[in-house]
Structure formats: structure tokens, C-alpha cells
């Protein structure tokens, strides 16, 4: 989490700041959504538990050609300790349930806001 600021960052980003920025990006996506997000692409639903950042990235990384979520994908990679590539799946996916990206983002946003309020940043 200390590297989330990337090269342009003046220093390490506190975990709470990184989570706030991710939340703000998801808010931005949901508020600026005019046409169906990512053309209505479907992704695997995930269990919003420990390890969900990697699981969320594993789901969203399979959506290609959707500029609206590229920043989210990059931000999630900062929360996931291992490299994630398309086609990779963790046990946290609800493998029999696919939902639209818009719903996925909404569910993730709600959960992350509560984690922020409860001070759970890792």
C-alpha cells in the first residue's frame, strides 16, 4: 500500500488516503455513468471479505476496452500484493454468478465506504 502513489507521488500514501481515493474514483464512475458502463459487460461476483481487492481486480481485469474502469483497475492493483492477469480466479469469486460491471462497482463502493468508516484499510 505504501507504493500506491506511483512515480508522481511525493512520498508514501497512507492506507486511509489510498482507500479514500479508490472510493472517490468509484463514486466518479457511478455518477458519470450515462450509457451502460463498459457496454453492459458481465463480471464474476465476488465475496466481499478478506482478499477482496485481489478478487475484485481478477474480476475487472477480464473487462477489456473499457476506459471508464482503467484507473480503478490500476488502483486495485496497488491493494493486491500479487500480480493479477486476465483469466485468473480466486476462491473468492462466486463462480456461478455474473453481474453487470455497474452493479459490481456499486456493491464494491458500498463495501469500501463502510471499511473506510470502520478504519479497515488493509
Amino acid at each position: 500500500l505504501t507504493c500506491l502513489g506511483g512515480f508522481a507521488s511525493p512520498g508514501p500514501v497512507p492506507p486511509s488516503t489510498a482507500l479514500r481515493e479508490l472510493i472517490e474514483e468509484l463514486v466518479n464512475i457511478t455518477q458519470n455513468q450515462k450509457a451502460p458502463l463498459c457496454n453492459g459487460s458481465m463480471v464474476w461476483s465476488i465475496n466481499l471479505t478478506a482478499g477482496m481487492y485481489c478478487a475484485a481486480l481478477e474480476s475487472l481485469i477480464n473487462v477489456s476496452g473499457c476506459s471508464a474502469i482503467e484507473k480503478t483497475q490500476r488502483m486495485l492493483s496497488g491493494f493486491c500484493p500479487h500480480k493479477v492477469s486476465a483469466g485468473q480466479f480466486s476462491s473468492l469469486h462466486v463462480r456461478d454468478t455474473k453481474i453487470e460491471v455497474a452493479q459490481f462497482v456499486k456493491d464494491l463502493l458500498l463495501h469500501l465506504k463502510k471499511l473506510f468508516r470502520e478504519g479497515q484499510f488493509n
Partner: antibody, heavy 120, light 112 residues
Amino acid sequence: EVQLVESGGGLVQPGGSLRLSCAASGFNIKDTYIHWVRQAPGKGLEWVARIDPANDNIKYDPKFQGKATISADNAKNSLYLQMNSLRAEDTAVYYCARSEENWYDFFDYWGQGTLVTVSS
Amino acid sequence: DIQMTQSPSSLSASVGDRVTITCRSSQSIVHSNGNTYLEWYQQKPGKAPKLLIYKVSNRFSGVPSRFSGSGSGTDFTLTISSLQPEDFATYYCFQGSHIPYTFGGGTKVEIK
């Protein structure tokens, strides 16, 4: 329109139990936190408990642990507070309140309250 | 548990007066996310409380500009710049940073 309506209060004997309800409308309870706050006659406000109906994450004031049980029914968009082993000092107006839905920074809506009177 | 101590517990004032209510927490109420969840609520007899100020100094929508909040760390203040007839009520501070959340004992503002 957002509304919280409490019910279930009334007169109960010492040692008795009561289940208070809080019916929510105008929003989905899973999108926020719901709290119970009580106020004894002529006294101040007391925070009792909080629930996240999305995952049943519950927090109590230790003073009420074992005395109060908070729960939610998402299908009915309703909250409950089960009060056991009631004593005279539990006589109070019980309010449910919700955390606002953006960052959960404060209580933006409250119910009208329901009065619980513990007396023989 | 964090104790929230309000003072005074009651005060008498006239319409137009500047009123200051203080609230002191027994320890810092800065949350681990960096926010300070200090709120002020107004309550009138037989009614539910109403939010005035959140996160120390932010006025809730629809709250008149005569209400303001300030402070940091453990010391907080609610100021009513020019008391109006509808402001006679009881005021509570509240900390929502650390569980169990706690209210101050209240300050009753009465007509002089």
C-alpha cells in the same frame, strides 16, 4: 421520502422483555448503518448499538451487551431491538437513527421514538 | 469508553445573545481514517434530535449560518452567533469516532 418509524414500546414488568421495531422506508437499509439511541425521561441521549444490515456487523455499548440485541430483516427493510431483563432504569424513549449514505458521517434521519416504561 | 463532558449544563440567554457551548472528550476523537466525527445535535421537548454540525465544523444542509462549530483534538465548541426564539432547546455533542459512541450530557439553553 426517507422515514424511520419505531413501534413496540409500552408498559412492561421488571424482569420482562420487549422487542422494539424500526420500519424504514425511502431507502434500503443495506446501504447504510442503523443505530438505536435511548433517552430516559428528563435525561440525556445514550447510544445503544449499531448494525450494518448488509453483513450483520454489530457493535454495542458494553453497557448494553447481553441486555440488548440488535437485528435486521432486509426483506422487510426493518430493524429490531430486543430488550431483556428490563429494570426501572431502562424506562426511556428509544429512537432508531440512520447514518447518512455518502460517508456515514452522521445521523441524518431519526424516528419519532417509542416509549418503554418498566414498572410493576 | 470516551467521556464527552459538556459545559455549561444549562444557561439562560436573551434573543440576540451570542452563546457558546463547549464539549471536551476524555481522549482524542480523531478516527484512524483521519476524520474527527464530532457532531452537535439540537433537541426540543418531545422531539427527536436534529443534526446541526458534523465533523467538527460542517453545517448540515438547512441549518442557519448563525450556528458554527470549531475545535480539534479534545476540545470543541458550538457557537450560536445571535440567539433566535426557535433556538431555545437542549444541545448535545456526540463522538462517532470510537465505539462505543458517546453523547455529551447536554446543555439546556433557556430564555432569560
